[in-house]
Interface confidence: medium
């Protein structure tokens, strides 16, 4: 057997809604022929399934084999290094991979201007891999919240944060003109999931958007 291969130092999941990626750190001094074996355990079925015999990358997309994540007790994964006939011990994820580990995101933010208001509509994520019945709003059916950050360019303020409890919001601009840039971070009040800020969407507000009322 020769010298034993060292195990990958760490293995962890990074997940968004129906985008479940397993990551690991490489073993020290790996050779060009070193690759990694990935196995998956579903809680309640106490046996390991081999998913990939020889991955040469440092991550693996497990979405397709964890589609029931949102209706299950979760998963553990393990990875070991393989080099020819040699292999290391397994390194197992430290924590159970469950719905709680999924980072919440939004699909996009649409902005429009109406009579001095900026109207925002939050589009929920619609990943291609998700089964038809597993929408964001069916899985997170209650207590959806969004933190809104608005930056005005140029202007005398950087951010205004607001928690809204639905997918629409409006901001009265009170005569301010300029470019307004909006980001949204989702959360679910009853859950501990982390949220990720969306990319910034901007809209320009000029005097033409204001109507005069007597």
């Amino acid at each position: 057997h020769g010298t034993e291969l060292p195990s990958p130092p760490s293995v962890w999941f990074e997940a968004e809604f129906f985008h479940h990626i397993l990551h690991w750190t490489p073993i020290p001094n790996q050779s060009e022929s070193t690759c990694y074996e990935v196995a998956l355990l579903r809680y309640g079925i106490e046996s390991w399934n081999s998913i990939s015999n020889c991955s040469q990358t440092l991550s693996y997309d497990l979405t397709a084999v964890t589609l029931d994540l949102y209706h299950s007790n979760g998963y553990r994964a393990r990875v070991r290094a393989v080099d020819g006939s040699r292999h290391s011990n397994w390194t197992v994820t430290n924590t159970r991979f469950s719905v709680d580990e999924v980072t919440l995101t939004v699909g996009s933010v649409n902005l429009e201007i109406h009579n001095g208001f900026i109207l925002g509509k939050i589009q929920l994520p619609r990943p291609k891999m998700a089964p038809a019945n597993d929408t964001y709003e069916s899985i997170f059916s209650h207590f959806r919240e969004y933190e809104i950050a608005i930056r005005k360019v140029p202007g005398n303020f950087t951010f205004t944060h607001k928690k809204v409890k639905h997918e629409n919001f409006s901001l009265l601009t009170s005569g301010e003109v300029g470019e307004f840039c909006v980001q949204v971070k989702p959360s679910v009040a009853s859950r501990s999931n982390k949220g990720m800020w969306s990319k910034e969407e901007c809209i320009s507000l000029t005097r033409q958007y204001f109507t005069v009322t007597n």
Epitope: H161, K162, K163, T173
Partner: nanobody, 127 residues
Framework: EVQLLESGGGLVQPGGSLRLSCAAS????????VGWFRQAPGKGREFVSA????????YFGDFVEGRFTISRDNSKNTLYLQMNSLRAEDTAVYYC????????????????????WGQGTLVTVSS
Amino acid sequence: EVQLLESGGGLVQPGGSLRLSCAASGRTFSSHTVGWFRQAPGKGREFVSAITWNGDTTYFGDFVEGRFTISRDNSKNTLYLQMNSLRAEDTAVYYCAAATGQVWSLQYLRESSYAYWGQGTLVTVSS
């Protein structure tokens, strides 16, 4: 009529922290958007931060850069401004102010939207 009384100012070294308080009496504090403005020596009053009646919306001036947090305790009729990583340019008199109205609006960035003002508390950042 709302009366506002600021406290918590003082001398602090650069990089230090201070927590300002604003105690309100008179009309119901909890129905107002309240905020902080500041006035540096020889300069005009500038917007620092504001918070809506239920605390779900906060506003910050562009110089804040994440260093300050604003909060309120309606049961104690008190507004707070936690100031961290203070710089010499933060030296100013800090004023507490209360506005009427509850819409999510940029009007709260303007001095003219605030009907009630405190007397101010001096913050000096110096080594």
